[in-house]
C-alpha cells in the first residue's frame, strides 16, 4: 500500500524525505524562513499528513505563503515611508518611521527603520517591536528672533510665530458674584503642559491659604497673536492645575505652577514648546540678555487708577516683547531692601531690567517666560517666569522686574509632568 510521490511546496520542504511512503508513514510539511504553511486559508507553522491504508494521502500538500506584517502601526506625530516598491509589507520588507519635523524629533535619535520579521512583526534593531517616540522639539521658533530689540513697556509687536510657546491663561472664577476674571501668561513645555507663575492660578480666596483655582475656571490659548482675534488660536481647558506646594503668597517665593491641558495640542509653526534649563542653582548669569513677551500693559504712562477704571482696555491687543538684561542678585536685593515695604528677593528669584527704567514687564504679563538663547544647543530656554515688581509704575527707574528662577525647579517640573528626565533628555537644554 504505497502512497504517491510527494512534491514539497514552493518555499517549503517535507520531512522525512523518502523515495517511497507506505501505510502509516507520516510527513511534516514546513516552510522556509519568512513563509507560513497555508491550509484551507488557515496559517500554521507546520502541517502533518499520513499515508492511508488505501494508498492515498490524508490531505493535499498545503502551500507556503510569504509572511505579511500587514500595515504598520500609526506613529503619533510621525510619518511612515516604505523602502520597498509597491509598499510591500511582506517578509524582509522595510519601512521607515520619521517624526513631523521640525516640530517633533525621534527619541534617542533612533533610525526609525523597521523590517518585517519571519514572525510577521515589524522589528527595529534597538526597540524591537515597540514603536519609536516622537517628542516635541523645543526652543526653536519657526521664525528667528531679531537680534536687536528696543524695548512690554517700551516693547515691540511680536510677529506671529516668534514666541510659539507663549500661552494666554484666562481665569474666570464663576463661584463669586459677580464673576471674577483675570489673566496671565504661560509657556508651553510639551503638547500637554503649560508652565506659569503660581500667583496667576491661586484662587482669589478670603484667607492666606494657597489653593489653586478650580480647573473648570481656566482656559489656555496657544498660537495667539492678537487678543481681538482668537479664531486662529488653539484653546484648551485644564485637566489639572498644580501650584508649587511651597508657594508663599506673602513674598512670592516658589512662584511656579503647571497646567495640564485637557487634550494635547497639535504643534506647528505658531505652537511649539520652549526648552527647560539644566538644574542649576545659579540661574542665568548677570548681564545675560533675555526676551519676555506678554499682552500686559504696554503704556508706561498709564496709572493704576486708569487701569482700574478702563478695565482691560489698557491691555495690548498684539503680543509685545522686550529684551532685558539679568541684573546681579546683590544689586537687585539692595534696590528692593532700600524701599519701604517688606520686599524679599530670595535665591529662587532673579531680577531683570535697566537701571534707567523704560523697559519692563507689567501687570498682566505674569507667568510669562523669560527666555535666553543657549548657544550650545541653539535653542531658547525658559530661565524665568514673570513674578512681581516694585510698587512704583512699571518701567520706573531702578525698579527691576522679579522673575522665578526656573532652573531651581526642573526636577519638580519633570516630576509633575510624570516624565523621568532620561526619557525627555532631548527636550532639555544640551
Amino acid at each position: 500500500n504505497e502512497c504517491p510521490e510527494l512534491q514539497p511546496p514552493v518555499h517549503g520542504k517535507i520531512e522525512p524525505s523518502q523515495a517511497k511512503y507506505f501505510f502509516k508513514d507520516q510527513v511534516l510539511v514546513s516552510c522556509d524562513t519568512g513563509y507560513k504553511v497555508l491550509k484551507d486559508n488557515v496559517e500554521m507553522d507546520t502541517f502533518q499528513i499520513e499515508c492511508l491504508k488505501d494508498g492515498t494521502w490524508s490531505n493535499k500538500i498545503p502551500t507556503c505563503k510569504i509572511v505579511d506584517c500587514r500595515a504598520p502601526g500609526e506613529l503619533e506625530h510621525g510619518l511612515i515611508t516604505f523602502s520597498t516598491r509597491n509598499n510591500l509589507t511582506t517578509y524582509k520588507s522595510e519601512i521607515k518611521y520619521s517624526c513631523q519635523e521640525p516640530y517633533y524629533k525621534m527619541l534617542n535619535n533612533n533610525t526609525g527603520i523597521y523590517t518585517c520579521s519571519a514572525q510577521g512583526v515589524w522589528m527595529n534593531k534597538v526597540l524591537g517591536r515597540s514603536l519609536p517616540t516622537c517628542l516635541p522639539e523645543c526652543g526653536q521658533p519657526s521664525r528667528s528672533l531679531p537680534s536687536l530689540v528696543k524695548r512690554i513697556i517700551g516693547g515691540r509687536n511680536a510677529e506671529p510665530g516668534l514666541f510659539p510657546w507663549q500661552a494666554l491663561i484666562v481665569v474666570e472664577d464663576t463661584s463669586r458674584v459677580p464673576n471674577d476674571k483675570w489673566f496671565g501668561s504661560g509657556a508651553l513645555l510639551s503638547a500637554s503642559w503649560i508652565l506659569t507663575a503660581a500667583h496667576v492660578l491661586r484662587s482669589q480666596r478670603r484667607d492666606t491659604t494657597v489653593i489653586p483655582v478650580s480647573k473648570e475656571h481656566v482656559t489656555v490659548y496657544l498660537g495667539l497673536h492678537d487678543v481681538r482675534d482668537k479664531s486662529g488660536a488653539v484653546n484648551s481647558s485644564a485637566a489639572r492645575v498644580v501650584l508649587h506646594p511651597d508657594f508663599n503668597i506673602q513674598n512670592y517665593n516658589h512662584d511656579i505652577a503647571l497646567v495640564q491641558l485637557q487634550e494635547p495640542v497639535p504643534l506647528g509653526p505658531h505652537v511649539m514648546p520652549v526648552c527647560l534649563p539644566r538644574l542649576e542653582p545659579e540661574g542665568p548669569a548677570p548681564h545675560m540678555l533675555g526676551l519676555v513677551a506678554g499682552w500686559g500693559i504696554s503704556n508706561p504712562n498709564v496709572t493704576v487708577d486708569e487701569i482700574i477704571s478702563s478695565g482691560t482696555r489698557t491691555l495690548s491687543d498684539v503680543l509685545q516683547y522686550v529684551k532685558l538684561p539679568v541684573v546681579p542678585h546683590a544689586e537687585c536685593k539692595t534696590s528692593y531692601e532700600s524701599r519701604s515695604g517688606n520686599y524679599s528677593v530670595t535665591e529662587n528669584m532673579f531680577c531683570a531690567g535697566y537701571y534707567e527704567g523704560g523697559k519692563d514687564t507689567c501687570l498682566g504679563d505674569s507667568g510669562g517666560a523669560f527666555v535666553i538663547f543657549d548657544d550650545l544647543s541653539q535653542r531658547w530656554v525658559v530661565q524665568g517666569l514673570v513674578s512681581w515688581g516694585g510698587p512704583e509704575e512699571c518701567g520706573s527707574k531702578q525698579v527691576y522686574g522679579v522673575y522665578t528662577k526656573v532652573s531651581n525647579y526642573v526636577d519638580w517640573v519633570w516630576e509633575q509632568m510624570g516624565l523621568p528626565q532620561s526619557v525627555v533628555e532631548p527636550q532639555v537644554e544640551r
Epitope: 464663576t174 482669589q204 484667607d207 501687570l363
Partner: antibody, heavy 113, light 112 residues
Framework: QVQLVQSGAEVKKPGASVKVSCKAS????????IEWVRQAPGQGLEWIGE????????NYAQKFQGRATFTADSSTSTAYMELSSLRSEDTAVYYC??????WGQGTLVTVSS | DIVMTQSPDSLAVSLGERATINCKSS????????????LAWYQQKPGQPPKLLIY???TRESGVPDRFSGSGSGTDFTLTISSLQAEDVAVYYC????????FGQGTKVEIK
C-alpha cells in the same frame, strides 16, 4: 429669579446649639459661595464665614472658627449654619447671602436662659 | 483682619442734596491680578436685609438708581448719593472682600 429662604426664628438656652437653614433657588446652587452674616439688635453687620456647596470648601472668620460649622445639601439646594456653645451675645439676626448680591430674609436667634 | 472705618457715623441731608459717605480700609483692597478693588456698598432699611448697591468700588448693581455712585481705590472709598430721595433713608455699610470680609460700622442717612 434668585431667592434665598431661611428657616424660622429660634429661641435657645446658653450652651446649646442652633442650626439655621437657607434654601436657594433660581441658580446653580453648587457653583456659588454662600456667606453667613449676623446682626445683633441695633448693631452693625458681622461676617461669620462662607461655604462653596459644590466642593464643601469653607472659610471662617477667626472669631467663629471652631464654633460655627457650615454644611450644604446639594440635593435640596440648602445650606446650613450651625453655631454651638451659644451665649447671650449671640442673639442676632442671622443672614445667608449668595456671594455678595442676594440676601435671605434673616433668621432671629434669641439666646436666653 | 482688615479694619473698615466709615465716616461720618450719621448724616442728615436735605432732599435733593448730595450725600457723601467715606470708607477707609486698613490696607489696600486693590488686587493687582484682577485690577479690581474688592469693596462693596450696601443699603439697609429697618427690618429688611441689606441690599447690594455697588461692587468693585464703582460698579453699580443692576436695578440700582444712577444717583448712587461709588469711587476710590486702594484704601479710600466714597459712596455718593447725588440727589437724596426720601426712600434713601437707611443705614449704609461698606464691606471689603479682598480678604476675610469685614464691614464698616455703618452710616445712618436721614433727611434734614
Amino acid at each position: 429669579q434668585v431667592q434665598l429662604v431661611q428657616s424660622g426664628a429660634e429661641v435657645k438656652k446658653p450652651g446649646a446649639s442652633v442650626k439655621v437653614s437657607c434654601k436657594a433657588s433660581g441658580y446653580t446652587f453648587t457653583g456659588k459661595w454662600i456667606e453667613w452674616v449676623r446682626q445683633a439688635p441695633g448693631q452693625g453687620l458681622e461676617w461669620i464665614g462662607e461655604i462653596l456647596p459644590g466642593t464643601g470648601s469653607t472659610n471662617y472668620a477667626q472669631k467663629f472658627q471652631g464654633r460655627a460649622t457650615f454644611t450644604a445639601d446639594s440635593s435640596t439646594s440648602t445650606a446650613y449654619m450651625e453655631l454651638s456653645s451659644l451665649r447671650s451675645e449671640d442673639t442676632a439676626v442671622y443672614y445667608c447671602l449668595r456671594s455678595e448680591d442676594v440676601w435671605g430674609q434673616g433668621t432671629l436667634v434669641t439666646v436666653s436662659s | 483682619d482688615i479694619v473698615m472705618t466709615q465716616s461720618p457715623d450719621s448724616l442728615a441731608v436735605s432732599l435733593g442734596e448730595r450725600a457723601t459717605i467715606n470708607c477707609k480700609s486698613s490696607q489696600s483692597l486693590l488686587a493687582s491680578r484682577t485690577r479690581k478693588n474688592y469693596l462693596a456698598w450696601y443699603q439697609q432699611k429697618p427690618g429688611q436685609p441689606p441690599k447690594l448697591l455697588i461692587y468693585w468700588a464703582s460698579t453699580r448693581e443692576s436695578g440700582v438708581p444712577d444717583r448712587f455712585s461709588g469711587s476710590g481705590s486702594g484704601t479710600d472709598f466714597t459712596l455718593t448719593i447725588s440727589s437724596l430721595q426720601a426712600e434713601d433713608v437707611a443705614v449704609y455699610y461698606c464691606k471689603q472682600s479682598y480678604n476675610i470680609p469685614t464691614f464698616g460700622q455703618g452710616t445712618k442717612v436721614e433727611i434734614k
